[in-house]
């Protein structure tokens, strides 16, 4: 027997998420050590409740002076998590966030793990790797992606309602076929998930089944439900 | 569990009217279209209409208007579909199929012949 | 009314090909669609739903895809038991129609 509701079917379509991990081979070496402060910036989207692994710029470990890991999380103070290579030393400022950890002993890996990652992880996180030849830099801007809960019903007369409740970011909504709909809403919550509302409806009595679609950057969704017949409209002439 | 039981087969006369069942039993009978779908021998499959049960509303494809008529019974969950005026060319196999073609019968074979 | 064109009529493949039948729905007509196996005697299984959803319990050596109105059906590794033949059927507008039906036979 299907799991499918016998007219409304839910799947999830093609998932778009990147890995979990943008670590380079941390045995490749920064050519010519160049005395220029190297800053890479990343834009990363990471999904809710999936683990994430944050790494430095690929330094030899010989060359390493002080590791430092800045987080800064929205309404947070910044949280810095230090390893001292000469003297073993860990230390940590203002980190209260218990599923951001190094990923095991600095001093074997440097790369930062969140686990799990949760809606309050949005931030900007820094790694400073401090050399003789000076500080190279890899900077991350998370963004936490929240999946939507979609749902489709008929709410009268040949209109539908499709909702993508709670989705970080937005949600797109579209039809098959098109309809007559009215503007789609948007409802912000405090955490940063919105939903998306798109009503529509449908005079071609020829009409069977609606498909609401929703695109969003953790995969996208599509739902059908075959429209109820208008009530008083008793037969089809014969 | 969604079930749709049809009769496996029907022989009739040229010129007489069949009714075939399908009984519908695992989900609300009345809250969902019910389809109809012929298929001649070795050949595609054609849409026949569709019946609401909760209304006894019903569409026609235009070939099948005047030869088909779909009704239910809401008491025990069946769904008919009469076919009058029977030829060879009605010789086929008729399923009946909810869940937006979700869900089939097994199928009724008509067999017209003198 | 909407027709659908399938193609291939027929196809002959070995065992472990990739094989590929089409759905087209005339005049750019914006559908949803579903694909069916149907072997000899029985009633046709559905398969894929809402053009790209495998329906629970299908093997998922099948897939669906979509290009406007052009769908293909996609067997990745061709097995024995896929000796059949294949329909599609779009349900957004009435009357639903279907393909004409790929038979997919085994060299």
């Known amino acids: 027997q299907s799991n499918n509701s016998l007219m409304l079917q839910t799947s999830k379509e093609n998932h778009t998420l990147a890995s979990n991990s943008l670590c380079m081979d941390e045995k490749q070496i920064t050519q010519n050590h160049s005395k220029v402060l190297a800053e890479v910036n990343i834009s990363w989207p990471v999904q809710m409740a999936r683990n994430a692994v944050l790494c430095c710029p690929p330094i030899e470990f010989r060359n390493l002076i002080v590791i430092t890991w800045e987080i800064i999380l929205r309404g947070q103070p910044s949280c810095t998590k230090s390893y001292r290579k000469e003297t073993n030393e860990t230390k940590e400022t203002n980190c209260t966030d218990e599923r951001i950890t190094w990923v095991s002993t600095p001093d074997q890996n440097s790369d930062l793990q969140i686990h799990p990652v949760a809606i309050t992880h949005d931030g900007y996180y820094r790694c400073i790797m401090a050399t003789p030849d000076g500080n190279f830099h890899r900077g991350y801007h998370l963004q936490v992606l929240v999946t939507p809960e979609v749902t489709l019903f008929e709410s009268r007369n040949r209109t539908a309602v499709c909702k993508a409740v709670a989705g970080k970011p937005a949600a797109q909504i579209s039809w098959i076929p098109a309809g007559d709909c009215a503007p789609t809403e948007q409802e912000y919550w405090g955490n940063g998930t919105v939903t998306v509302k798109s009503t529509c409806h449908w005079e071609g009595h020829n009409v069977s089944t609606v498909t609401c679609h929703v695109s969003h950057l953790t995969g996208n969704k599509s739902l059908y439900i075959e429209l109820l017949p208008v009530p008083g409209a008793k037969k089809s002439a014969k | 569990q969604v079930q749709l039981q049809q009769p496996g087969s029907e022989l009739v006369r040229p010129g007489a009217s069949v009714k075939l069942s399908c009984k519908a039993s695992?989900?609300?009978?009345?809250?969902?279209?019910m389809h109809w779908v012929k298929q001649r021998p070795g050949q595609g499959l054609e849409w026949i209409g569709n019946i609401y049960p909760g209304s006894g509303t019903t569409n026609y494809d235009e070939k099948f208007k005047s030869k088909a008529t779909l009704t239910v019974d809401t008491s025990s969950s069946t769904a008919y579909m009469q076919i009058s005026s029977l030829t060879s060319e009605d010789s086929a196999v008729y399923y009946c199929?909810?869940?937006?073609?979700?869900?089939w019968g097994q199928g009724t074979l008509v067999t017209v012949s003198a | 009314d909407v027709q659908m064109i399938q193609s291939p009529s027929s196809l002959s493949a070995s065992l472990g090909d990739i094989v590929t039948m089409t759905c087209q729905a005339s005049?750019?007509?914006?559908?949803?669609l579903n694909w069916f196996q149907q072997k000899p005697g029985k009633a046709p299984k559905l398969l894929i739903y809402g053009a790209v959803n495998l329906e629970d319990g299908v093997p998922s050596r099948f897939s669906g895809s979509r290009y406007g109105t052009d769908f293909t059906l996609t067997v990745s590794s061709l097995e024995d038991e896929d000796m059949a033949t294949y329909f599609c059927?779009?349900?957004?507008?009435?009357?639903?129609?279907f393909g004409g039906g790929t038979k997919l036979e085994i060299k």
């Open positions: 059927l779009q349900h957004t507008y009435l009357p639903w129609t």
């Open positions: 199929t909810t869940g937006t073609s979700t869900y």
């Open positions: 005049q750019g007509t914006s559908i949803n």
């Open positions: 695992g989900y609300t009978f009345t809250s969902y279209w």
